[in-house]
Amino acid sequence: KFSKQSWGLENEALIVRCPRQGKPSYTVDWYYSQTNKSIPTQERNRVFASGQLLKFLPAAVADSGIYTCIVRSPTFNRTGYANVTIYKKQSDCNVPDYLMYSTVSGSEKNSKIYCPTIDLYNWTAPLEWFKNCQALQGSRYRAHKSFLVIDNVMTEDAGDYTCKFIHNENGANYSVTATRSFTVKDEQGFSLFPVIGAPAQNEIKEVEIGKNANLTCSACFGKGTQFLAAVLWQLNGTKITDFGEPRIQQEEGQNQSFSNGLACLDMVLRIADVKEEDLLLQYDCLALNLHGLRRHTVRLSRKNPIDHHS
């Protein structure tokens, strides 16, 4: 369950995250599995551990192997495994399959290609992008933050796209490249004013004081890949991050699901250890895209706890 493949090229930076993630305050110890040797945390080492991250600055072919991360969480030390493979640089332009990240597809209206794993690195814009080893030039290509946008996508735009960026660690720079395939979908998608499937407008959700509660905000935005679509929660009209209540968090990562061909997004609001004051708040599920914004409001009501022990 908690094992992950990671790969990189020799003489480039590679940063691997422990597949067994914990809370930021948890200590994480790293070991090279074959020898059970501890990975040092001192940054002067070429390979060193930094909390949940294992850094190869730069990577060498001999670094390949399985690395164990142990998350020192309460009650149990939880173990994860990172299977790292470092490859020699290819002399020709071909990028072998084993160096490819997941394929992404786009259409005329939506053609975003994200640079894989870039969020693990300390990089600064702009990214360099290449298609089949040729640097991308022309007004149709726009490097925006961590992704590439292609205007007026055509079937000829399909191919292998490589992003290249510089990772900075304590003043030293290391190159990183990552490649993924891009395919072009023929089907014509469309975009609609957001439709919120859950929660119902003015829904009353029963919760138990002292227990955890989850609220799911689910909305659909049209058919096919959407260029701009988001769902989020607000508390009393304030963003969750700005509200400042650590017990109430949005679940990271909005998974785009295609049910009946529709493009839908979910966002789960997790309330830990529900308190009386939570019942007084207004919970707004917001869905927005280029057409506009739709809001459904939820309120919490107390559910009498069941005595599980009687």
Epitope: K1, F2, R20, G22, K23, S25, Y26, T27, R72, S73, P74, T75, F76, R78, T79, K211, N212, R270, A272, D273, H308
Partner: antibody, heavy 122, light 111 residues
Framework: EVQLVESGGGLVQPGGSLRLSCAAS????????MHWVRQTTGKGLEWVSA???????YYPGSVKGRFTISREDAKNSLYLQMNSLRAGDTAVYYC????????????????WGQGTTVTVSS | DIVMTQSPLSLPVTPGEPASISCRSS???????????LDWYLQKPGQSPQLLIY???NRASGVPDRFSGSGSGTDFTLNISRVEAEDVGVYYC????????FGGGTKVEIK
Amino acid sequence: EVQLVESGGGLVQPGGSLRLSCAASGFTFSTYDMHWVRQTTGKGLEWVSAIDLAGDTYYPGSVKGRFTISREDAKNSLYLQMNSLRAGDTAVYYCARGGDGYNYDYYGIDVWGQGTTVTVSS
Amino acid sequence: DIVMTQSPLSLPVTPGEPASISCRSSQSLLHSDGYHYLDWYLQKPGQSPQLLIYLGSNRASGVPDRFSGSGSGTDFTLNISRVEAEDVGVYYCMQALQTLTFGGGTKVEIK
């Protein structure tokens, strides 16, 4: 209603085997750490084993190598396979819910079963 | 292994009077996340244990507010502000910092 129901206890001879089961309902079983805790007659509580959401298992020295904990998330079920049983293993065995291993949220061992009795005797 | 030591072994109480139980661990129960992984449980006669207090001082759902937990590091206390007849049973402290270890228990009975 959040509930744990144990079964499988009984009388077994020393050196014998027994498999305990625990059926969970009323919560998302797959995200929780689960424990077996036992209590010998008139004595205190002793932790016997645990399994986290990844299926990683944990045991105290007293049962390591003899007991095996497992889970079947699709069936909301927890198991304890007990081999090479000794008279000292005679106890009431409780199935208990631990923390949320997905979010690392801990609210105590907040749900306990009614217990199932294991007697090891010749 | 972390060893948990409870005192007293037995505690005769008078309804309406306060009572307290002490629990000591062989090492600090403070985790790097800032919480003390110490719980209190009550096992009433003929019943399964039930959670009273978790993480040192948090009352579990449905637990009367006459129960409170305090302490830090290695020394913890369970307080009952006014004992009621239904509070009789065996009280256990338990550490959850490194697997689980229970204290020996304190038997609370009406005088």
